[in-house]
C-alpha cells in the first residue's frame, strides 16, 4: 500500500525531515508550507492551520521559497554611473552594473555598489592592461619606436611609421613625419599589441602591466606594492 500523503501542517515522523517547500515550525512542532518567491509569511502555522502567505509589497521581494515575516527591501535606485540590468520585482532584487567606460570599484553580491571611471592614458602612454568589469585600465609609457597621441582608455602604443626620408622623428606622443610619399608601417621593437575591448563589460583578459616609474599624480594600482604604470589622467 502506498504511504498516505500528509497535508500540512503535520507532525513529522521521528528522525525524518520536512519535505521540499516545507519547513519545521519550532513553536507548532509541525511541518508547514513555505511561501513561494514573491510572497512572505503573513501568519505562521499552528498545529491546526497552515502558513498564511501574502504578496510582497512594492519595492520588496523574496527570491526563494521562504517563511520570512517580511519581504526584503530592494536595493536603492541605480546611480548615474550605473545601468539597471535587472529591475526590482516581487521575486528579484534590482541589479545595477557599471555603464560603459566605467568599472566596478566596490562590488556587492549581485551587481555593483560603486562604479568608477576607467582611467584614460594620456599622450605618450598606452593601455598595458585593458579595463574589465572589476578592474581599472593600466597605462604604460610607449616604448622607443612606438607612440600614442590620444587620451584614451582603450588605445595602445602604435609603431612609428618607417620613412624613406624622415622629416620629423617620432617620439612617445607623436608619429614620425616622412618627406617621402610612400611611408611603410613597421613593427617597431617594443610595440605593444593588446586586444581592444569592445565593451568593458565582458573584458576579462588582464595582460601583465610592465613596471614603470612612479608618476607625479595618483593612480589605481595593480596588486601589490610594485610601482604603478604611469600616464593616467582623469575622466
Amino acid at each position: 500500500l502506498p504511504a498516505q500523503v500528509a497535508f500540512t501542517p503535520y507532525a513529522p515522523e521521528p528522525g525524518s525531515t520536512c519535505r521540499l517547500r516545507e519547513y519545521y515550525d519550532q513553536t507548532a512542532q509541525m511541518c508547514c508550507s513555505k511561501c513561494s518567491p514573491g510572497q512572505h509569511a503573513k501568519v505562521f502555522c499552528t498545529k491546526t492551520s497552515d502558513t498564511v502567505c501574502d504578496s510582497c509589497e512594492d519595492s520588496t521581494y523574496t527570491q526563494l521559497w521562504n517563511w520570512v515575516p517580511e519581504c526584503l527591501s530592494c536595493g536603492s535606485r541605480c546611480s548615474s554611473d550605473q545601468v539597471e540590468t535587472q529591475a526590482c520585482t516581487r521575486e528579484q532584487n534590482r541589479i545595477c552594473t557599471c555603464r560603459p567606460g566605467w568599472y566596478c570599484a566596490l562590488s556587492k553580491q549581485e551587481g555593483c555598489r560603486l562604479c568608477a571611471p576607467l582611467r584614460k592614458c594620456r599622450p605618450g602612454f598606452g593601455v598595458a592592461r585593458p579595463g574589465t568589469e572589476t578592474s581599472d585600465v593600466v597605462c604604460k609609457p610607449c616604448a622607443p619606436g612606438t607612440f600614442s597621441n590620444t587620451t584614451s582608455s582603450t588605445d595602445i602604443c602604435r609603431p612609428h611609421q618607417i620613412c624613406n626620408v624622415v622629416a620629423i622623428p617620432g617620439n612617445a606622443s607623436m608619429d614620425a613625419v616622412c618627406t617621402s610619399t610612400s611611408p611603410t608601417r613597421s613593427m617597431a621593437p617594443g610595440a605593444v599589441h593588446l586586444p581592444q575591448p569592445v565593451s568593458t563589460r565582458s573584458q576579462h583578459t588582464q595582460p601583465t602591466p610592465e613596471p614603470s616609474t612612479a608618476p607625479s599624480t595618483s593612480f589605481l594600482l595593480p596588486m601589490g606594492p610594485s610601482p604603478p604604470a604611469e600616464g593616467s589622467t582623469g575622466d
Partner: antibody, heavy 121, light 110 residues
C-alpha cells in the same frame, strides 16, 4: 555603534617599515571603501590611500610605491604597510570610512581617533 | 602647498555669521562634490557637510555649504564658542586621481 580603531603606530628609524591596522565595528565592512588620511604635527590633512574591493586601490603621490593599503573583510580590518619611511611621513594616521552614493558623491563619513607615527633617528 | 585654497584664519563673535571659502579648479571642485570637515582641538576630523550642501544627521542646521563653479563655501550662522575649530574642505581631483584637501581654516570665536 560605528567605530574605527587604529593601532600600530610608534617610533621608527628612517628607511624602516611599520604596519598600521584599523579595526572596524558596527557596520558591514565590505560594503564600504576605506581610507587612510594623515596629519603632520601642526599641519593640515593629507589623503594617503583608499581601497575599495580587492585590488582597487588609490594612492597619494607622496606615498606611491612605498605604502600598500589592504583589507581583510573576514576580520573587518584595514591595513597600511609603510616601507622606506621618511621623516616627512611623521604624522597622526587616521582611518576613515568612505561613504558613497555615487562616484562623484563620496566623503569620509566616519573617522578613527588616529595613531601617531614618528620617523626619526 | 594645498591643491584647494582656504584662508588660514577666520573669526567672529557669538551669534554672528561667518563664511569660509575654498577655491579649486575644474578638475576638483567644479567636476566633483565638495565635503567639509570640522576638527575640534585635539580630536579627529568629523564630517560636517557632504555632496556640496548635505548635512549628516546630528549636524546643526547652523552649518550650510554651497558651491559655484570652482569655488565652494561653508557658512556658520549663530556662531557659538564650541564652533572654534579647524575647518577643511576636500574634493576628489580627476586629474590627480586622488583626494585633495584645503590647507584648513582656523576659526576663532572672539
Amino acid at each position: 555603534e560605528v567605530q574605527l580603531l587604529e593601532s600600530g603606530g610608534g617610533l621608527v628609524q628612517p628607511g624602516g617599515s611599520l604596519r598600521l591596522s584599523c579595526a572596524a565595528s558596527g557596520f558591514t565592512f565590505d560594503d564600504y571603501g576605506m581610507s587612510w588620511v594623515r596629519q603632520a604635527p601642526g599641519k593640515g590633512l593629507e589623503w594617503v590611500s583608499t581601497i575599495y574591493s580587492g585590488d582597487n586601490a588609490y594612492y597619494g603621490a607622496s606615498v606611491r610605491g612605498r605604502f600598500t593599503i589592504s583589507r581583510d573583510n573576514s576580520k573587518n580590518t584595514l591595513y597600511l604597510q609603510m616601507n622606506s619611511l621618511r621623516a616627512e611621513d611623521t604624522a597622526v594616521y587616521y582611518c576613515a570610512r568612505v561613504y558613497s552614493s555615487s562616484w562623484r558623491k563620496r566623503a569620509f563619513d566616519i573617522w578613527g581617533q588616529g595613531t601617531l607615527v614618528t620617523v626619526s633617528s | 602647498q594645498s591643491v584647494l585654497t582656504q584662508p588660514p584664519s577666520a573669526s567672529g563673535t557669538p551669534g554672528q555669521r561667518v563664511t569660509i571659502s575654498c577655491s579649486g579648479t575644474s578638475s576638483n571642485i567644479e567636476s566633483n562634490t565638495v565635503n567639509w570637515y570640522q576638527q575640534l582641538p585635539g580630536t579627529a576630523p568629523k564630517l560636517l557637510i557632504y555632496s556640496d550642501n548635505q548635512r549628516p544627521s546630528g549636524v546643526p542646521d547652523r552649518f550650510s555649504g554651497s558651491k559655484s563653479g570652482t569655488s565652494a563655501s561653508l557658512a556658520i550662522s549663530g556662531l557659538r564658542s564650541e564652533d572654534e575649530a579647524d575647518y577643511y574642505c576636500a574634493a576628489w581631483d580627476d586629474s590627480l586621481s586622488g583626494w585633495v584637501f584645503g590647507g584648513g581654516t582656523k576659526l576663532t570665536v572672539l
